[in-house]
């Protein structure tokens, strides 16, 4: 007796791992026999090479190699994601339609979310390793190696939670190098080494004791720069502090600093940076042109110490120590027109009040300069002669203009009608090209 | 279409807890990370938890940490954030986003707003 | 934790001028794979924040080509060649190299 097609067995979700082919079930009943024809994101699929897809007999599909990402549907955005496969089995009285199995390739992405830090723990004492692993499909798994070996995991003493590796009772045979292993089928990614560090236990109450330290941040002076760090160094300054209470000193010394905000304005976040120094030491990396708030912490293992006092300093500006980018000359009517990008903001070395146009000699444009004030990026200059018109631009700060970006030029022919400033797709004129093409 | 809805926003006690949900759909749930960001009235952005695809790795602020818990269930395409302990300075809308690796979060809900207070 | 700054903080712009948004971070972004994971997200008015560009300079699908973000480091802009009146909102940047994220303050761009 004949009867519509039925889906007795559906494809099921499945990882693609190669090397060999993937296999797609599907199994259906009905009367006469129905036929199988399978579907992609609910695109028919060709069978035809070099489609990578294969029927056999029995409506199984063969994936011979993953199929390309070409027609991912609407809101997958992982190159895990292969796509959704149905089979649909039709005869004369009807067709029926599979449930969706999706096919995935394995993938292990290589930035760790967060990587296990050398560290420093005591004797007898608990200590946690971070690791944060790898974004994986499958999710990955983590271990840990400790000196190039897989470490023996003890109950009771080692857990490992959430990627991270909890040391119950510090021994003085955990000393070494501990790494982080993250773990797929689509391969494992190795974490930086960590170096641990096993101290025997000291007299005193570490917390106690450093809440007693007082720090004074005596001052902070801006350091010369160092002609080793070539011509435009971030500027660096010098901090001093004098440390009284107890006998047991701070292990260590950290920085914060942030820029200061306008009277009355929420203050900006603190950053923090380790000090190399226990009385004095140089903090790098600010920028010029800007107030800045200092203060001093003491810290010991994790315990911290009250902050220090704090101290502002204003470092002076600079001149922008880099051109304004993309500088373009353009025709309008009797008039040029020059526009610039602002130098970019690492180089501002400032705050930015305008810019120097100059005009340069030898060209339609006496010698001339003009000053734009503000955050404009454009000039208009009146011409009244075809020629040649080539121009600088540079940004100007508290201390001056900085340096002048390459000579951009435009040559406006008799007519008017044609200007070019960008020959054979090479970018703008430069002085040197504008006068070749002169003598030619 | 991608679709992200939050929903457990409310009014509540300072020291007292609340849990957040936020429903999925229109993607493969179980592949993507997820996070929760929440704004202060008038105030910026503020991230406050991420859990891994297979929910084993999460990772919070320490304004959060300890107070906070990030869950999921893959089987019903939903995430959750239990907040206990709660203080005045987490009043804010809370809002779920789907995370690309761990690279960016490229779809974000409505949001839903928690106001602690007494 | 790593700061984030953006400046300005408040930006009047001219409809169909150019814009210009500077985001810094306290250390370098760049890991030890030489991935740079910052992204710029714009929050129109009474609305969830929007992707606009990731991993730098990437621009996310359905985004105006009219956007564009550059920088590396600690120093990174967000530029929109032309302004529209649909752009006005706070944009914020995003750090996710290293845990915690931490976003920058937002600057606020209207039409002036």
């Known amino acids: 007796q004949d009867s519509p097609p039925q889906i007795l067995v559906h494809p099921q979700d499945q990882l693609f791992q190669g090397p060999g082919p993937a296999r797609m079930s599907c199994q259906a009943s009905g009367q006469p026999p129905p036929t199988i024809r399978w579907l992609l994101n609910g695109q028919p699929l060709s069978m035809v090479p070099p489609d990578p897809h294969h029927l056999l007999p029995d409506g199984t599909l063969l994936l011979l190699q993953p199929p390309a990402r070409g027609h991912a549907h609407d809101g997958q955005a992982l190159s895990t994601d292969l796509g959704v496969y149905t089979c649909e089995a039709s005869n004369r009285l009807g067709t029926a339609v599979s449930r969706g199995a999706r096919l995935s390739v394995a993938v292990l992405r290589e930035d760790f979310q967060i990587q296990p830090r050398d560290m420093v723990a005591v004797v007898g004492e608990q200590f946690t390793l971070e690791c944060g692993p790898p974004w994986g499909h499958p999710e990955p798994t983590v271990s840990w190696w400790k000196d190039g070996k897989p470490l023996a995991l003890q109950p009771g003493r080692h857990t490992v939670s959430g990627g991270s590796l909890l040391m119950a009772r510090a021994e003085k045979s955990d000393e070494g190098t501990y790494m982080c292993v993250a773990t797929n089928s689509a391969g494992h990614r190795e974490s930086r080494a960590a170096r641990v560090s096993i101290q025997e236990p000291q007299d005193y109450t570490e917390p106690v004791e450093l809440l007693a330290v007082r720090i004074q941040l005596e001052n902070v002076t801006l350091l010369n720069p160092d002609p080793a760090e070539g011509p435009k160094p971030r500027p660096a300054v010098w901090l001093s502090w004098k440390v009284s209470g107890p006998a047991a000193p701070a292990q260590s010394y950290t920085a914060l600093f942030r820029t200061q905000t306008a009277p009355g304005g929420q203050g900006a976040p603190w950053a923090e940076e380790l000090l190399a120094g226990w009385q004095s030491a140089e903090l790098g990396g600010l920028h010029w042109g800007q107030d800045y708030e200092f203060k001093v912490r003491p810290s010991s293992g994790r315990a911290r110490g009250p902050d220090s006092n704090v101290l502002l300093l204003r470092l002076p500006e600079k001149v922008p120590s880099a051109p304004p980018q993309e500088v373009t000359l353009k025709p309008g009517n009797g008039t040029v027109f020059v526009s610039w990008v602002p130098p970019p903001a690492e180089n501002h070395n400032g705050i930015i009040r305008g810019y120097q146009v100059w005009s340069l000699g030898n060209t339609s444009l006496p010698p001339a300069n003009w000053t734009v004030v503000g955050e404009q990026t454009q000039l208009e200059i009146a011409t009244h002669m075809p020629g040649s018109y080539c121009v600088q631009v540079a940004a100007v700060t508290g201390a001056g203009a900085g340096e002048p970006s390459r000579p951009v030029c435009l040559l406006l022919e008799q007519a008017m009608e044609r200007a070019t400033q960008e020959p054979s797709e090479h970018g703008p004129w430069t002085l040197e090209q504008l006068r070749a093409t002169l003598k030619r | 279409e991608v679709q992200l809805v939050e929903s457990g926003g409310g009014l509540v006690q300072p020291g007292g807890s609340l849990r957040l949900s936020c429903a999925a759909s229109?993607?493969?749930?179980?592949?993507?990370?997820m996070s929760w960001v929440r704004q202060a009235p008038g105030k910026g952005l503020e991230w406050v938890a991420t859990i891994s695809n297979g929910g084993t790795y999460t990772y919070y602020p320490d304004s959060v940490k300890g107070r906070f818990t990030i869950s999921r269930d893959n089987a019903k395409n939903t995430l959750y954030l239990q907040m206990n302990s709660l203080r005045a300075e987490d009043t804010a809308v809370y809002y779920c986003a789907r995370l690309i690796y761990y690279d960016y979060l490229d779809y974000w809900g409505q949001g839903t707003l928690v106001t602690v207070s007494s | 934790d790593i700061v984030m700054t953006q400046s300005p903080l408040s930006l009047p712009v001219t409809l169909g001028e150019p814009a210009s948004i500077s985001c810094r971070s306290s250390q370098s972004l760049e890991n030890s794979n030489g991935n740079t994971y910052l992204n710029w997200y714009l929050q129109k008015p009474g609305q969830s924040p929007q992707l606009l560009i990731y991993r730098v300079s990437n621009r996310f699908s359905g985004v105006p080509d009219r956007f564009s973000g550059s920088g590396s480091g600690t120093d990174f802009t967000l530029k929109i060649s032309r302004v529209e009146a649909e752009d006005v909102g706070v944009y914020y940047c995003?750090?996710?190299?290293?845990?915690?994220?931490?976003f920058g303050p937002g600057t606020k761009v209207d039409i002036k």
């Open positions: 995003l750090q996710v190299t290293h845990v915690p994220w931490t």
């Open positions: 229109g993607f493969t749930f179980s592949t993507y990370a």
